[in-house]
């Protein structure tokens, strides 16, 4: 970058070199040039020379102010004409940043996915802070009050091995830049309580011919978790609001759930899974299509990510329904 | 087999107002939205709203809400798109598009606006 | 407002090429974009929808993949019909704003 240049003199910034976006900053340029008393000093930023708010100050030292910089990165030099030279001569460069400090991490969520391995540590980090920013995981064992930690970027990943000091922690986030220092509240975690099961996959769907149409959506999951709750969003492609359907499902079997839709309408599925009672919520699966047909012929239509499913003994699933509407990934 | 029918051309002037058809057939009108978008010369496309004839619900473009309005005219299939007090930065190519919530599947083979004195 | 960033803009390549263009969403939009075809004179054409969804009647040469903010369509084995522009949009909120297209010439 600019600041491996050779210099012949000084650039330096006031009140440093990052710093709070929106704030006046002077940029002063010292030159050490030997056999020159400078001219004139000129400032370049991004390699475009300015033109304004540039004050001699002595000699051989010049400022640059800048009023509410709001650049998030910007590469500053400065040059000197000296007389009797033809070009101007460069004295020094430096990379200046401005950004925000961290806002107080929240929302701390941990979850362990099944067969990961891992537990899988997220929170919202806010404002976008646009420096370079290092979150510390702080993982504290209520049993052994051993504490660990974590440096990463953004989300941590733990391996579940590691985790020696039984099963009640206390996690909490630090977030740090060069601006400032903010920490989370502290959660509380059981391992048993947290753990996501194997993600549910709707396989494929059929329409069977009766006296009223019905179709069926074959689902299952890898999970070894045995009281597992479920449930299965659908609606017609043309409508905003989800018809949600709620299990409770034994994974022994795949599983059929039988739905009555209107004849030539396009659906779309999607199941999630929790351990039954716990607190968090599998990611809702990918998005599954069916085309009911017009008339009572047998349609099938197969999951995108599967080209054929061994679908082994199946069961009927008990349901409930009720109506919600995610107007986020809808109009509304 | 589906089909979604526009004029080729529309040529108004500025200040005016002008109402685009698309003629939809060989489907349940009122069971799909129908859309619009537009692509000024050289441009990329637009989404500008839509409407759902089995409800009349609308959604509009914040960008196009004062110089759109959408209707229907179930009668005839029909769904319009009016443009008003035209600029000649409103000269484009309007497309409609039959569509749910994850895909537009069937366009027309949109209409070209000319705002010209 | 959401932004899709499509690259590249332009693309010079051979019949029986393979090419990948991309989309990249300004936040994650759960698979909720699709890709059409546009050819002068001729209406825009669905190719994918919901990331990996094949619409009726579109070749097998076309595929669609990617999750949270990077998709992108794939076309094996280009053929002389595939040459024009394509566009993504997502559909994850309105406005359900379009990627500014990639040409796609013959070399």
């Known amino acids: 970058g600019i600041t491996n240049i050779n210099c012949s003199g000084h650039i330096w910034v006031e009140p440093a070199t990052i710093f709070k976006m929106g704030m006046n900053i002077s940029i002063y340029c010292q030159a050490a040039i030997k056999n020159c008393q400078p001219r004139k000093l000129h400032f370049y930023k991004n390699g475009i020379k300015e033109r304004f708010q540039i004050t001699r100050i002595n000699k051989t030292t010049a400022r640059l102010w800048y009023k509410n910089f709001l650049e998030p990165h910007a590469s500053m030099y400065c040059t000197a004409e000296c007389p009797k030279h033809f070009q101007e001569t460069l004295i020094c460069g430096k990379d200046i940043s401005s950004g925000y400090p961290p806002d107080i991490p929240d929302e701390v969520t941990c979850v362990i996915y099944e067969y990961s391995g891992n537990m899988t540590c997220t929170w919202n980090a806010g404002k976008l802070t646009y420096i370079d920013t290092k979150y510390v995981v702080h993982v504290k064992s209520l049993e052994t009050e051993e504490e660990q930690q974590y440096l990463t970027s953004s989300y941590i990943n733990i391996s579940t091995d590691s985790l020696q000091g039984g099963k009640k922690y206390l996690v909490w986030v630090q977030a740090a830049n060069a601006l400032g220092m903010e920490e989370s509240k502290q959660l509380q975690i059981h391992l048993d309580d947290i753990v996501i099961p194997s993600a549910a996959v709707i396989s494929r769907a059929e329409t069977i011919n009766a006296t009223v149409p019905k179709t069926i959506i074959y689902w299952d999951s890898q999970t070894t978790i045995e009281k597992v709750s479920c449930e299965m969003r659908y609606k017609a492609t043309t409508n905003q609001t989800w018809n949600v359907k709620e299990f409770d499902t034994n994974f022994t079997y795949v599983q059929q759930s039988e739905f009555y839709l209107e004849p030539n309408i396009k659906y779309v599925f999607q199941v999630r899974c929790q351990e039954t009672g716990k607190r968090y919520w599998q990611p809702w699966s990918s998005l599954f299509f069916h085309k009911t047909p017009e008339t009572v012929p047998q349609v099938t239509s197969k999951a995108f990510q599967h080209d054929t499913w061994n679908s082994g003994l199946t069961v009927a699933s008990i349901s409930t329904g009720h109506l919600t509407s995610d107007n986020r990934g809808d109009i509304g | 087999q589906v089909q979604l029918q526009q004029p080729g051309a529309e040529l108004v002037k500025p200040g005016a107002s002008v109402k685009v058809s698309c003629k939809a057939s060989?489907?349940?009108?009122?069971?799909?939205?129908i859309n619009w978008m537009n692509q000024r010369p050289g441009q990329g496309l637009e989404w500008i709203g839509n409407?759902?004839?089995?409800?009349?619900?609308?959604n509009y473009n914040e960008k196009f809400k004062s110089k759109v309005t959408l209707t229907v005219d179930i009668s005839s299939s029909t769904a319009y798109m009016q443009l008003s007090s035209l600029t000649s930065d409103d000269s484009a190519v309007y497309y409609c598009?039959?569509?749910?919530?994850?895909?537009?599947?069937?366009w027309g083979q949109g209409t070209t606006l000319t705002v010209s004195s | 407002d959401i932004q899709m960033t499509q690259s590249p803009a332009s693309l010079s390549v051979s019949v029986g090429e393979t090419v990948t263009i991309t989309c990249r969403a300004s936040?994650?939009?759960?698979?909720?974009i699709t890709w059409y075809q546009l050819k002068q004179g001729k209406s825009p054409q669905l190719l994918v929808y919901?990331?990996?969804n094949l619409a009726d009647d579109v070749p097998s040469r076309f595929s669609g993949s990617g999750s949270g903010t990077q998709y992108s369509l794939k076309i094996n084995s280009l053929l002389s019909e595939d040459f024009g522009t394509y566009y993504c949009?997502?559909?994850?909120?309105?406005?359900?704003?379009f990627g500014g297209g990639t040409k796609l010439e013959m070399k």
């Open positions: 949009q997502h559909f994850w909120g309105t406005p359900w704003t």
């Open positions: 598009a039959r569509g749910d919530f994850y895909a537009l599947d069937y």
């Open positions: 936040e994650n939009i759960y698979s909720h």
């Open positions: 409407i759902y004839p089995g409800s009349i619900s609308t």
């Open positions: 919901a990331s990996t």
């Open positions: 060989g489907y349940t009108f009122t069971k799909y939205w």
